[in-house]
């Protein structure tokens, strides 16, 4: 069964910078990746970035840079411009559309006790929804 993993990490040098890492574990080729925050895409979440292997990427503030790390994983750098850090309590979700499997989505957040530079364990928290 395909799985999606999500890691959220705070940068050690800049406490206002976060990076979301997402990956797809399974067969098939990735046709689209959507990163949202505040909940799953289409279920109360707001798209932060969309990555397509051919069409390119689109991102919206506070996303700073979205890029492919491998053919089945991506990273999204976030810049927190506020004085406090809302990202610390925010859920980030990644949805991978894969042919012919369908869509798979998981969510993650920065662990409350995590130190700067440490990331969340790569434990998938699957949302059981395959389109």
């Amino acid at each position: 069964t395909p799985e999606v993993w999500v890691q959220v990490q705070m940068e050690a040098t800049e406490l206002s910078s976060f990076t979301v890492h997402c990956g797809f574990l399974g067969p098939g080729s990735i046709s689209l990746v959507t990163v949202s925050w505040g909940g799953p895409d289409g279920a109360g979440g707001t798209k932060l970035a969309v990555l397509h292997p051919e069409l390119g990427t689109r991102q919206w503030a506070p996303a700073r840079q979205a890029r492919w790390e491998t053919q089945s994983s991506i990273s999204l750098a976030l810049e927190d411009s506020g004085a406090s850090s809302p990202f610390a309590n925010t859920t980030f979700c990644c949805k991978f559309a894969s042919f012919p499997e369908g869509s798979w989505e998981s969510c993650g957040s920065l662990p409350p006790s995590s130190d700067p530079g440490l990331s969340a364990p790569p434990t998938p928290v699957p949302i059981l929804r395959a389109d």
């Epitope: 689209l32 505040g38 798209k47 969309v50 389109d131």
Partner: nanobody
Framework: HVQLVESGGGSVQAGGSLRLSCVAS??????????MAWFRQAPGKEREAVAG???????TYADSVKGRFTASRDNAGFSLFLQMNDLKPEDTAMYYC???????????????????WGQGTQVTVSS
């Protein structure tokens, strides 16, 4: 709940121009559809696709409007525009905005899978 609101319709002489706008709004979050599209329906006729634009900026147009109509989206991703030039009487119709998400981010053919629709804005072109 997602709502689409169109504006910019009106009456114009043949050869004139109009710019339609559509804004997608949602309760509690920002909705950025993969695909936003314009459709139109003239009295007594079936609804037809006019133009579509995906989240990456890729556009498709009906043959009848190519070279005259231009679809665009704002940088924030939730507004859709339609610049209509060299309008003809046969462009008279109610124009509807539609939006939805597709598996690959592109606009599906003929608007299939666009599950949100606006109430429409009337465009009347007189000769």
């Amino acid at each position: 709940h997602v709502q689409l609101v169109e504006s910019g319709g009106g009456s114009v002489q043949a050869g004139g121009s109009l710019r339609l706008s559509c804004v997608a709004s949602a309760s509690g979050f920002t909705y950025r559809p993969y695909c936003m599209a314009w459709f139109r329906q003239a009295p007594g006729k079936e609804r037809e696709a006019v133009a579509g634009i995906d989240i990456f900026g890729g556009t498709t147009y009906a043959d009848s409007v190519k070279g005259r109509f231009t679809a665009s989206r704002d940088n924030a991703g939730f507004s859709l525009f339609l610049q209509m030039n060299d309008l003809k009487p046969e462009d008279t119709a109610m124009y509807y905005c539609a939006a939805g998400d597709s598996p690959d981010g592109r606009c599906p053919p003929l608007g299939q899978g666009l599950n949100y629709w606006g109430q429409g804005t009337q465009v009347t072109v007189s000769s």
